[in-house]
């Protein structure tokens, strides 16, 4: 009821609170003297449910039935209205509508570690929308009995605050708990437990590895644990994978010695435990350990590849070319490679450790039978040699992989296909796909890229280091015992027309004709591999259509001669460069007139 | 044991508006109405607003238009934000719990509406 009302008075029957689906009676009766002045007969009494009206009486009281209230509280407010003036409030009341407690479920108690307390969880069933107070009661041997209440809104847990001891590991205890609001109170099933039952160990703690010997066969996992465990699991991975191997040992006395761990590999590690083979449960995991295995000697050989080029009559430029080990292979963290280039048959061996490249050049007689073994060094060994015999790779024209071509495979990946050579494709031992970017100078400093495939393959794809409109020189190497044939072809992932014509930088006269000399358009502005130049012509003034000359396109080539302009008369000359996509605008325009004589 | 303090009261002139705070202690919060009354000087207690757990609004008629009620149940706060004020808004409002073994009371704020 609204506090001190002073005008009348709201009564609800049978009751404030009530059942869902109970009907109430409501009742606003006036006090004396508290009606409408000189009219008494005009008081007009109106019931509202928060701010609806639901009901009116002109007299001293009002009745009012109601039904179908909603769960939760419902405000009842009783107004007087006289004539020629506001309504005001007599009174009002609250009902509270709700439902008695259900059952609890699923009680169910533990006590974390051997000094923990006993703590105890339910389900308890829905919500009544009522004040309903939970009492938690656990009875144990020698008639003993704890209760614990509690005052919180939403109860579903308690804690006794007392300790089982395992003294007595087999006594049984049993816990029961009690819901009870105004309308009505429920008890659950009883939970029957002993001692080993409910208490769930803490989890490990202080856990450490150690490797005897700096050797990753030789690992112990150490923790420490519960005066009382029985049983533990271990789990572990590389840190840098979601799946979990799993270990269960018992009395492991706070070690246990792992087998199967990689080297140089960062680990974590948990550890749970329990008290009991069936009974009890297992505690959390453990803070996780992080820890790195020692490395071993890497396994597995370098892929090792190399390009050679001619400096002059004497001398060549070998470069070596080799891949990382995989992590797996390296076993560890690779401090330098060992070089070692040979000549087979005077037997002199110069040998190089080679730290932060993976490449190597150097000038070699061209006389003589030479030979590389490279091999990676980490800090327990190395590797074992991958041995190569330096030989012309592009040698034998009858091992040449014939009808090589290079078609975009989608987004950055190029797809290179050939056909097996003319001599005995039985022959071929493997295939090598190099490519690396074009640079018309032919510059050696270009990384180079490739990939070894079986004799059986006529295709691959290449996806590493592939970049959108750049063009790459693609060979196909055939490899026969010490033998080698090769062909080439351009190819881009993507392409389209050029965004600059070459800049014509010379048009000089030679015998009646005229040399265009031009710069090659800078490699970002190839968009792709030029298939041809064309050089245009026409005579100055004239609004003829110009004169063509289409070039194929070659790396090396920046000149071009043409023989059919009339002497004395002055043209304008330009270009354009062509992808599969399209022709460039225009280069620069050169005037020219030739001074020759005549026809 | 609940308790409720009410704050944001004063003085404003007819035309303007306050916005009252309840912070309330203890967890039946978030299942009982939260009330707003006010008493004027010599006049009983009158029930003003009153909000659900889930945040239905209700008003007096001579609330409606000008005030409005809303609850945030993480800060277990309610609010009234009064607009339009008048010199008949003049009163101490207090916040109210309404729970089926008693109701809970604020101290109460004073609003003065004088020009």
């Known amino acids: 009821k609204i506090d001190a009302c002073k005008r009348g008075d709201v009564t609800v029957k049978p009751s404030h609170v009530i059942l869902l689906g109970s009907t109430v009676n409501i009742t606003c009766s006036l006090k004396p003297r508290q009606g409408c002045f000189h009219y008494s007969r005009r008081n007009k009494l109106i019931l509202y449910k928060f701010d609806r009206r639901i009901n009116f009486h002109h007299g001293h009281s009002l009745n009012s039935q109601v039904t179908g209230l909603p769960l939760g509280t419902t405000l009842f407010v009783c107004k007087l209205a006289c004539i020629n003036s506001d309504e005001i409030q007599i009174c009002g009341a609250e009902i509270f509508v709700g439902v008695a407690p259900e059952q609890p479920q699923n009680l169910s108690c533990i006590q974390k570690g051997e000094q923990g307390t006993v703590a105890c969880t339910w389900e308890r069933g829905r919500d009544t929308h009522l004040y309903t107070e939970y009492t938690l009661q656990l009875s144990g041997p020698k008639n003993l009995t704890w209760q614990k209440q509690c005052k919180d809104i939403y109860c579903d847990y308690l804690d006794f605050g007392i300790n089982l001891t395992p003294e007595s590991p087999e006594s049984n205890f049993t816990a029961k708990v009690t819901a009870v609001n105004s309308l009505g109170s429920s008890s659950s099933l009883p939970s029957t437990f002993t001692f080993l039952d409910i208490v769930r160990p803490l989890p490990p703690w202080d856990i450490r590895i150690k490797f005897q010997k700096a050797s990753v066969s030789r690992c112990t996992l150490y923790w420490r644990d519960e005066g009382l465990v029985l049983l533990n699991r271990l789990r572990y991975r590389p840190s840098n994978s979601r799946l979990w191997n799993m270990v269960n040992v018992t009395k492991a006395k706070g070690r246990h010695d792992l087998l199967d761990l990689k080297p140089f590999t960062e680990y974590e590690f948990q550890i749970s435990s329990k008290l009991h083979l069936y009974k009890g449960s297992w505690s959390d995991w453990s803070e996780s350990l992080r820890a790195q295995t020692p490395e071993e000697e890497p396994t597995g050989m370098l892929d090792v590849w190399y390009m050679k080029r001619h400096i002059d009559y004497s001398r060549q430029q070998i470069s070596l070319f080799w891949k990382n080990l995989s992590v797996s292979e390296a076993r560890g963290k690779i401090l330098h490679y060992q070089v070692t280039l040979q000549e087979l048959t005077g037997g002199k061996a110069m040998t190089q450790n080679i730290t932060g490249h993976t490449s190597w050049t150097t000038v070699i007689p061209r006389t003589g039978n030479w030979a590389v073994a490279v091999s990676a060094a980490n800090s327990k060994g190395s590797s074992l040699p991958t041995r190569i015999n330096i030989m012309n790779l592009c040698e034998a024209g009858l091992l040449a992989p014939r009808q090589v071509s290079a078609n975009s495979e989608g987004m950055d990946n190029i797809l290179v296909t050939w056909q097996p050579p003319r001599k005995d494709p039985s022959a071929v031992q493997e295939y090598v796909v190099e490519w690396r970017e074009l640079h018309p100078g032919g510059d050696t400093q270009v990384p180079l890229n490739w990939l070894r495939s079986r004799p059986y393959n006529v295709s691959a794809l290449i996806s590493e280091n592939i970049k959108s409109y750049i063009c790459y020189e693609i060979r196909v190497y055939a490899l026969s015992g010490d033998q080698g044939g090769c062909s080439s072809i351009l190819g881009n992932s993507k392409h389209k027309a050029p965004l600059s014509g070459p800049h014509i930088n010379a048009i000089t006269e030679e015998k009646g004709s005229i040399l265009i000399s031009w710069n090659s358009i800078p490699v970002q502005e190839q968009m792709g591999c030029l298939l041809h130049y064309r050089i245009y012509w026409k005579e100055r003034d004239s609004n003829s259509q110009p004169q063509l000359c289409e070039i194929p396109y070659r790396v090396s080539q920046n000149s071009h001669p043409i023989n059919s302009l009339q002497p004395r008369v002055t043209y304008v000359l330009w270009m354009t460069a062509l992808t599969a996509a399209g022709e460039s605008s225009h280069g620069n325009e050169r005037e020219f007139c030739l001074q020759g004589k005549a026809n | 044991q609940v308790q409720l303090q009410e704050s944001g009261g004063g003085l404003v002139q007819p035309g303007g508006s306050l916005r009252l705070s309840c912070i309330a202690s203890?967890?039946?919060?978030?299942?009982?109405?939260m009330d707003w009354y006010r008493q004027a000087p010599g006049n009983q207690r009158e029930w003003v607003a009153s909000?659900?757990?889930?945040?239905?609004?209700y008003y007096d008629d001579s609330a409606k238009g000008r005030f409005t009620i809303s609850r945030d149940n993480a800060k277990m706060t309610v609010y009234l934000q009064m607009n339009s004020l008048k010199p008949e808004d003049t009163a101490v409002y207090y916040c109210?719990?309404?729970?089926?073994?008693?109701?809970?009371w604020g101290q109460g704020t004073q609003v003065t509406v004088s020009s």
């Open positions: 109210k719990v309404p729970t089926e073994k008693g109701n809970y």
């Open positions: 203890g967890s039946i919060f978030s299942i009982y109405n």
């Open positions: 909000i659900t757990p889930s945040g239905d609004p």
